[in-house]
Interface confidence: medium
């Protein structure tokens, strides 16, 4: 029931943070127009990965798609590189967790296939969520370095000038959307590998074989615990599975004198 | 190199319509908003209309809204300006001006300046 | 009705310096709403000097420059030249997809 709890719960956050990865890849306020030094600016500068926008005072709004590849920073490339490939694992993820998850039954898939999958989207979501965060840090430390040389300018190169025109950037609604996405998504992730240890099915590390000893009937019980017919070395109900580590062999390679196959 | 050419003007009278066009030719006419303006003789520069770069935005001046509709055909790199009831106030040398805001540089900057202009077409409305 | 002024007509001696303005009948002028300017000689079409301010358009001289004086937009022209003789309009972005230029000043090199 934890397990699936676990699953569960990893799916959906995982969803969320991808829902809000891309919901970041697409918003226009990476960076916005800082206004220390303006707060009543008329228009008001914003920009995305894909576009740059102004709006005005009156509510005008105009945005412009960056036509060249060519002309913009290699780090912009980079950064949407990053959430792009954050949003195509991350979809992947959910499309292979929602065949691995416990409470959905596709035809007879073993629940050790279930396992592998569940562990698969968990690795898939946790490369997203560094995707996305990667991508957002980049993008942040690019805004912090230009802010800085920006406000290095505005004292230095404009002189006598009674008002300038230097314009500061500064972090956007994005970006925090970003990093809280990308985070949720690297915690889904850790949550479905956190579930794939559980959902690893003890069954499945031997076989459930009936051992016959004279006038007693010995077996093992899928407890993990040798049923103990009251003698020989049995009396102690030794524990022979301990968590899968041992192979099916090993786990029947110690028979008492009573036992036969 | 980058070039406007006006024409379609000429002597019309007062009601009627007439279509400037402005060719373009030297850059990515579809990345660019258009302009209008017009020079009545003797007198100063007045902005009549503006186009966005897709023709998803228009807007007029005043003293022509709901008379002179702009359009924009970036197949034929084409600008164009369609008047109707015509007046004779409306006689003056028209230019088509291109609107310089679409930068290579990240970010973009919006600079709502009119860097390129046409040699100008007159249009006379008298009867 | 929002009114964009500048001096009808102004003088200057070769060499010497002038600042044209660019005012609102209604309010101040700020970066806010881009001023540029340009120069036309009688028969020929507009050629953009300044643009946002204080940008110069390619091929422009740095004896023009733009700059906001009190709640002015200004044009300053430093070591004037005869062929600066002409006519110097400023346009101001209203917001909104509206542009509006100003009367012009005709600028005369004695």
């Known amino acids: 029931m934890a397990v699936t709890a676990c699953q569960g719960l990893g799916f959906v956050v995982s969803l969320i943070g991808i829902a809000g990865i891309i919901a970041a890849t697409c918003m226009d306020q990476w960076s916005t127009q800082d206004l220390y030094n303006n707060p009543v600016t008329a228009v008001f500068n914003y920009q995305g990965l894909w576009r740059s926008c102004v709006r005005e005072s009156s509510g005008f709004t105009e945005c412009r798609g960056y036509f060249t590849l060519l002309g913009l920073p290699a780090m912009l490339q980079a950064v949407r590189a990053l959430m792009i490939v954050g949003i195509v694992l991350g979809a992947i993820g959910l499309l292979v967790s929602i065949f691995a998850l416990k409470c959905i039954r596709i035809g007879s898939m073993e629940d050790s296939a279930k396992a592998n999958m569940t562990l698969t989207s968990g690795i898939m979501f946790i490369v997203s969520g560094l995707c996305a965060i990667a991508g957002v840090s980049v993008f942040a430390n690019m805004l912090v370095t230009n802010f800085w040389m920006s406000t290095a300018n505005m004292y230095t190169g404009m002189g006598g000038m009674v008002q300038t025109v230097q314009t500061r950037y500064t972090f956007g609604a994005a970006l925090f959307v970003g990093w809280v996405a990308g985070g949720l998504t690297l915690i889904g992730g850790v949550m479905m590998c956190i579930a794939c240890r559980g959902l690893a099915p003890e069954e499945t590390n031997y076989k459930a074989v009936s051992y016959h000893a004279s006038g007693h009937s010995v077996a093992y019980k899928p407890g993990g615990f040798k049923a103990s017919t009251g003698f020989g070395s049995n009396t102690k109900n030794k524990k022979i599975y301990d968590g899968g580590a041992r192979t099916e062999d090993e786990v029947q390679s110690y028979p008492s004198k009573h036992d036969y196959v | 190199q980058v070039q406007l050419v006006e024409s379609g003007g000429g002597v019309v009278q007062p009601g009627r319509s007439l279509r400037l066009s402005c060719a373009a030719s030297?850059?990515?006419?579809?990345?660019?908003?258009m302009h209008w303006v017009r020079q009545a003789p003797g007198k100063g520069l007045e902005w009549v209309a503006v186009i966005w770069y897709d023709g998803s935005n228009k807007k007029y001046a005043d003293s022509v809204k709901g008379r002179f509709t702009i359009s924009r055909d970036n197949s034929k790199n084409t600008l164009y300006l369609q008047m109707n009831s015509l007046r004779a106030e409306d006689t003056a040398v028209y230019y088509c001006?291109?609107?310089?805001?679409?930068?290579?540089?990240?970010?973009?900057?919006?600079?709502?300046?009119?860097?390129?202009w046409g040699p100008g077409t007159t249009v006379t409305v008298s009867s | 009705q929002t009114v964009v002024t500048q001096e009808p007509s102004f003088s200057v001696s070769p060499g010497g310096t002038v600042t044209l303005t660019c005012g609102l009948n209604s309010g101040s002028v700020s970066t806010s709403y881009y001023p540029s300017w340009y120069q036309q000689t009688p028969g020929q079409a507009p050629r953009t000097l300044i643009y946002?301010?204080?940008t110069r358009s390619s091929g422009v001289p740095d004896r023009f420059s733009g700059s906001i004086l009190g709640n002015k937009a200004a044009l300053t022209i430093t070591g004037a030249q005869a062929d600066d003789e002409s006519d110097y309009y400023c346009?101001?972005?209203?917001?909104?997809?509206?542009?509006?230029f100003g009367g012009g000043t005709k600028l005369t090199v004695l």
């Open positions: 030297g850059f990515t006419f579809s990345s660019y908003g």
């Open positions: 946002s301010t204080n």
């Open positions: 001006a291109r609107r310089y805001d679409v930068l290579t540089a990240y970010p973009y900057y919006f600079y709502y300046n009119m860097d390129v």
């Open positions: 346009v101001l972005y209203m917001g909104s997809g509206i542009w509006v």
